[in-house]
Amino acid sequence: MMTGTIETTGNISAKKGGSVILQCHLSSTMAQVTQVNWEQHDHSLLAIRNAELGWHIYPAFKDRVAPGPGLGLTLQSLTMNDTGEYFCTYHTYPDGTYRGRIFLEVLESSVAEHSARFQIP
C-alpha cells in the first residue's frame, strides 16, 4: 500500500535569466527511493538521480541544469520557453511510483517579484 505523500516547492514564478530550485520531498513512508526522474512539460527528461549511479543530466540541458540540492534540480539562465509544468517522479521499493508537479512561470524582469533560492526540508 502506498502511504507516502509528495511535497513540492509549490508553483513558482521567477525572472527571465535567473535561476530557480525545483524540489520534491517524499514523506510518510519508509520505502527506499531507488531513482528520481525530473521531466519537463513536454515530458522530455531533464535529469535522473539514481541511488546507485548518481546523477545523469540529459545532454540537451547540461548547460542550464545543475543537480541538487538533495534530490532537487536547479534550472539556470531561465527563458520564457521554460514556463510550464515540471514533474518529479520518485521510484521507490516496495511502494512503487510517486509523482509531484510544479508549475514554473518565467516572467520578464520588470514583472517578476521574486527569484529566490530556497529549499524545502
Partner: antibody, heavy 119, light 112 residues
Framework: EVQLQQSGPELVKPGASMKISCKAS????????MNWVKQSHGKNLEWIGL????????SYNQKFEGKATLTVDKSSSTAYMELLSLTSEDSAVYYC????????????WGQGTSVTVSS | DVVVTQTPLSLPVSFGDQVSISCRSS???????????LSWFLHKPGQSPQLIMY???NRFSGVPDRFSGSGSGTDFTLKISTIKPEDLGMYYC?????????FGGGTKLEIK
C-alpha cells in the same frame, strides 16, 4: 480593453466531441497564460487546466485528462478547448480566463459557453 | 489535491453589515519563495466570475476598499466592511500554489 470572446452555446449528443473557442483581444496573447474553468449545476467551479500561448505548453487537472484537450492558435489570438466523448456529466458552463502574471490566479474571464449534452 | 473549504455556505446579510468569509486549505499555501497564491472571486447570476483579491491581500483594479483579504498558511479571510447591493452573489476562493488549482465550494451572500 481586455476581452475574451467565447463561442456560443452548444447542444450535443452523448458520445460526441466539441470544441469551444476563446478569442482574446486588447492585450498580447502570448504574454499570458489562459485558464479553463468548469461550472456545474450553477455552483461548483473546477479548474480544468491551462494553455501557455508562448510555447504551446499545457497543464491539466488530472480529473480532466482525456476529457479536455487545450490548444492555442497564436495567429488568431484564440485558445481552444476540445471536450471528448461527452456525457451528461459534462453539461456545464465553461469559461476561459486569463492568468495574472506571477500570481497563479485569473483576472479577466470570458462570458462562458453553455454545453448541454442530451440525446 | 489540495482541498479548499469555505465557510459559511450561506451568509444572510443586511445592507451596511460587515461580514467575513473564511477559506481553509488542507495544506499550506506558502510556496518555497514565501509567496501565497490565494485569490477571491465574486460570481453574480448571469455574469462571469470577477476577481476581487489576489495574492491574499491585493485588491484587483476597480475593487472598492471595503473589500480586504488576510490570512496565511492554511487560513484565509475575505472581509467586506459595508455590504452594498452590488456585493451580493457567490464568493469563491481559489488556491494556485499547488497543482491542480482548486476552488472552495462557495459562499452565497444574500439578503436576510
Amino acid at each position: 480593453e481586455v476581452q475574451l470572446q467565447q463561442s456560443g452555446p452548444e447542444l450535443v449528443k452523448p458520445g460526441a466531441s466539441m470544441k469551444i473557442s476563446c478569442k482574446a483581444s486588447g492585450y498580447s496573447f502570448t504574454d499570458y497564460i489562459m485558464n479553463w474553468v468548469k461550472q456545474s449545476h450553477g455552483k461548483n467551479l473546477e479548474w480544468i487546466g491551462l494553455s501557455i500561448p508562448y510555447n504551446g505548453g499545457t497543464s491539466y487537472n488530472q480529473k480532466f485528462e482525456g476529457k479536455a484537450t487545450l490548444t492555442v492558435d497564436k495567429s488568431s489570438s484564440t485558445a481552444y478547448m476540445e471536450l471528448l466523448s461527452l456525457t451528461s456529466e459534462d453539461s456545464a458552463v465553461y469559461y476561459c480566463a486569463r492568468g495574472i502574471k506571477g500570481y497563479f490566479a485569473m483576472d479577466y474571464w470570458g462570458q462562458g459557453t453553455s454545453v448541454t449534452v442530451s440525446s | 489535491d489540495v482541498v479548499v473549504t469555505q465557510t459559511p455556505l450561506s451568509l444572510p446579510v443586511s445592507f451596511g453589515d460587515q461580514v467575513s468569509i473564511s477559506c481553509r486549505s488542507s495544506q499550506s499555501l506558502v510556496n518555497s519563495f514565501g509567496k501565497t497564491y490565494l485569490s477571491w472571486f465574486l460570481h453574480k447570476p448571469g455574469q462571469s466570475p470577477q476577481l476581487i483579491m489576489y495574492g491574499v491581500s491585493n485588491r484587483f483594479s476597480g475593487v472598492p476598499d471595503r473589500f480586504s483579504g488576510s490570512g496565511s498558511g492554511t487560513d484565509f479571510t475575505l472581509k467586506i466592511s459595508t455590504i452594498k447591493p452590488e456585493d451580493l452573489g457567490m464568493y469563491y476562493c481559489l488556491q494556485g500554489t499547488h497543482q491542480p488549482w482548486t476552488f472552495g465550494g462557495g459562499t452565497k451572500l444574500e439578503i436576510k
